[in-house]
């Protein structure tokens, strides 16, 4: 089975750890994809080690354990994010994550910094 | 983790053959695709051939029809039976390995992060 917190959020400019854990008696994992909604984020093959698709590579860290973390995080980042465990033999488990990600505190507390054009 | 050494590369006349092979080592699944990718000097890396998930294969165009990539999954072992030599195949051979299930079978090198040292091919006319 994958057991996995089914809703996180986290701020702006910061960072988040995706974790999913699998737990079987008979089942080892194989390989762990990760994916944000349809595009595939990165791969932990018990084979070849971590692979982080280039276009996150910038953002993205292998671990803790099998899973992520998104550092750098942005509105757009908001969303669903799918652990699928590929095991032998059982084949394959899935797990959904919905990150939620809001703006720093900072703004919210109307803290921001905007930049003041001379006057004159 | 996984290593791979190349072997059988050589010299050869343009019209012969050449069988290349690919031993992995120091993997517990042998769970992954593994390609042929060749390096000409002045050239860009070029993705030879593909091996995916369920035995499909993939070709580039300038081999296809000569060279035919097999796998012996119980030893882990990849070939490139290269036939119809020509001298533009003249390269440094390489094999990789990526993980399965990373979209389609294709020869983009982006997902293959473990290569051989490679074994050197030349066709001379």
């Known amino acids: 089975t994958i057991d996995t917190k089914r809703n996180i959020s986290a701020e702006e400019g910061g960072s988040v750890i995706l974790q999913c854990h699998f737990s079987s008696d008979t089942a080892e994992v194989t390989q762990v994809d990760w994916k944000q909604q349809d595009q595939l984020l990165a791969i932990y093959s018990v084979d070849l080690g971590w692979h982080v698709a280039s276009v996150f590579s910038d953002r993205v860290v292998p671990g803790p354990s099998l899973g992520l973390t998104f550092q750098s995080l942005t509105m757009n980042d908001t969303g669903e994010y799918f652990c699928t465990y590929h095991t032998y033999p059982g084949g394959i488990y899935k797990g959904r994550i919905f990150l939620k990600v809001q703006e720093s505190s900072d703004d919210r507390n109307g803290l921001a910094q905007f930049q003041t054009a001379p006057l004159g | 983790q996984v290593q791979l050494a190349e072997s059988g590369g050589g010299s050869v006349q343009a019209g012969g053959s050449l069988r290349l092979s690919c031993a992995a080592s120091?993997?517990?699944?042998?769970?992954?695709?593994m390609g042929w990718f060749r390096l000409a000097p002045g050239k860009e890396r070029e993705g030879v051939a593909a091996?995916?998930?369920?035995?499909?294969?993939t070709y580039s165009d300038s081999v296809k029809g000569r060279f035919t990539i097999s796998k012996d999954s119980a030893n882990q072992i990849l070939y490139l039976q290269m036939n119809s030599l020509k001298p533009e195949d003249t390269a440094m051979y390489y094999c990789a390995a990526r993980p399965l299930w990373t979209g389609d079978c294709d020869l983009s090198s982006s997902w293959y992060k473990t290569w051989g040292q490679g074994t050197q091919v030349t066709v001379s006319s």
């Open positions: 120091g993997y517990k699944y042998g769970v992954y695709s």
């Open positions: 091996i995916c998930s369920g035995g499909r294969t």
